[in-house]
């Protein structure tokens, strides 16, 4: 690919180093941390982005889950192992040989174990619920306007096919965006819902991953939509396997 050939930058990922060292002297952008060449015409995988961001501060979240099998990323940042496609390896381990299994968005889905822990396959996260609370406004947003604006955002900014935005719910001040994408639905070239959700999460936090673009300026009919809290729930195609001890804690 040629990534912004003129000045050799990666519009979709600022956590890259770009150089005219690709085939034929073309611009080639490699993700920090992993060194993998990325396709700058689409989103970079969450695994490569987390690897690039490994030195960032830890983020811990522990809020109520909407269903017994939904996962929240309580473990925060870690330096992940990515496969040659840039996806999370099913088993992740830290420097002290503590290992655990993750889903396709890199969230832990088992208890932690040792190096003998087996994670047979990378389980796909097929349903993501993004739960937002917006700052107080003069009145509630019009639901259909809000729905249209958020669908436009995911389509245009994150290049996510509209069919994967299953629903947008709104009960002031709570907005819920449901993303659904089964393995069978995801075609080659489709943006992964996990990657789109991660870019959205970083945008909402004012930590945009896009090169040189302004931060996210969300407006519904000209009215700014300012988010004061975000929670993301992940549902896997196969329920997670935690011990009863954790579930009752």
């Amino acid at each position: 690919h040629t990534a912004a050939q003129d000045n050799c930058t990666c519009p979709t990922n600022k956590m890259t180093v770009c150089s005219p060292d690709g085939p034929g002297g073309r611009c080639q952008c490699r993700a920090l941390g992993s060194g993998m060449a990325v396709d700058c015409s689409t989103l970079t995988s969450k695994c490569l982005l987390l690897k690039a961001r490994m030195s960032a501060p830890k983020n811990a979240r522990t809020l109520v889950r909407p269903s017994e099998h939904a996962l929240v990323d309580n473990d925060g940042l870690y330096d992940p192992d990515c496969d040659p496609e840039g996806r999370f390896k099913a088993r992740q381990c830290n420097q002290t040989s503590v290992c655990w299994c993750v889903n396709s968005v890199g969230v832990r889905r088992t208890d932690k174990g040792d190096l003998s822990l087996r994670c047979d396959e990378l389980v796909r996260t097929h349903h993501i619920l993004i739960d937002l609370r917006h700052r107080p406004t003069a009145g509630a947003f019009n639901h259909s306007d809000l729905d249209a604006e958020l669908r436009r955002l995911f389509r245009e900014r994150y290049r996510l096919h509209p069919k994967f935005v299953a629903a947008v719910h709104y009960e002031q001040p709570t907005i819920q965006i449901e993303l659904r994408q089964n393995t069978s639905q995801k075609a080659a070239g489709d943006v992964d819902i996990g990657d789109a959700a991660y870019y959205f999460e970083r945008d909402i936090k004012g930590e945009s991953l896009f090169q040189g673009r302004g931060g996210l300026d969300l407006r519904v009919r000209g009215e700014p939509l300012q988010v004061e809290r975000t929670l993301i729930y992940y549902l896997d195609e196969i329920p997670p396997k935690f011990s009863m001890k954790r579930l009752t804690a």
Epitope: H1, S19, S34, M36, A37, C82
Partner: antibody
Amino acid sequence: QVQLVQSGPEVKKPGASVKVSCKASGYTFTIYWLGWVKQAPGQGLEWIGNIFPGSAYINYNEKFKGRVTITADTSTSTAYMELSSLRSEDTAVYFCAREGSNSGYWGQGTLVTVSS
Amino acid sequence: DIVMTQSPDSLAVSLGERATINCKSSQSLLNSGNQQNYLAWYQQKPGQPPKLLIYGASTRESGVPDRFSGSGSGTDFTLTISSLQAEDVAVYYCQSDHIYPYTFGQGTKLEIK
């Protein structure tokens, strides 16, 4: 034309440090990755790490982490590889190389001998 | 780390004959984003730095004779010298530059039979 010229051979005692230089010319030093490769006598090639001089991003092979430091001086278009706490198994030829899909440019190599 | 395994370790071929060196990687070197295989082949003669022959698994570096060709994708790659010349006697290495740390095969020593 692109050239990478390395510093001369070094003989060091165990426990000492060595700093090998690699002066680049014939291209824009700051916009290409520059890597370092080790070749022990009669052995194969081993990637030590690399640097992107324009932004000083550096990557190290875990095997060498802690003992190797890669730096670059953009004012002189020179990259450096410093190896500390030298031991006999560090005796090798060290190469610098411009990296990339079609960047077949290597320095001539610097022999570092560690001997008491 | 990606492990690169070459076969054979050494090879003796008659002048004018075909020489084939294989390289197998422990993980795929095919980048799905740009459909490029991050695999290079180098030739090294005694006392010299390695010389790039092939990059992207199959693209010949400029100035490299066309008797050298590379093929393969994913995890299995081959370097072929269609008609061996005396000056081709050297050690040949495959290298992955897909993910850090970049890794090399152990080398294949090519001699004349």
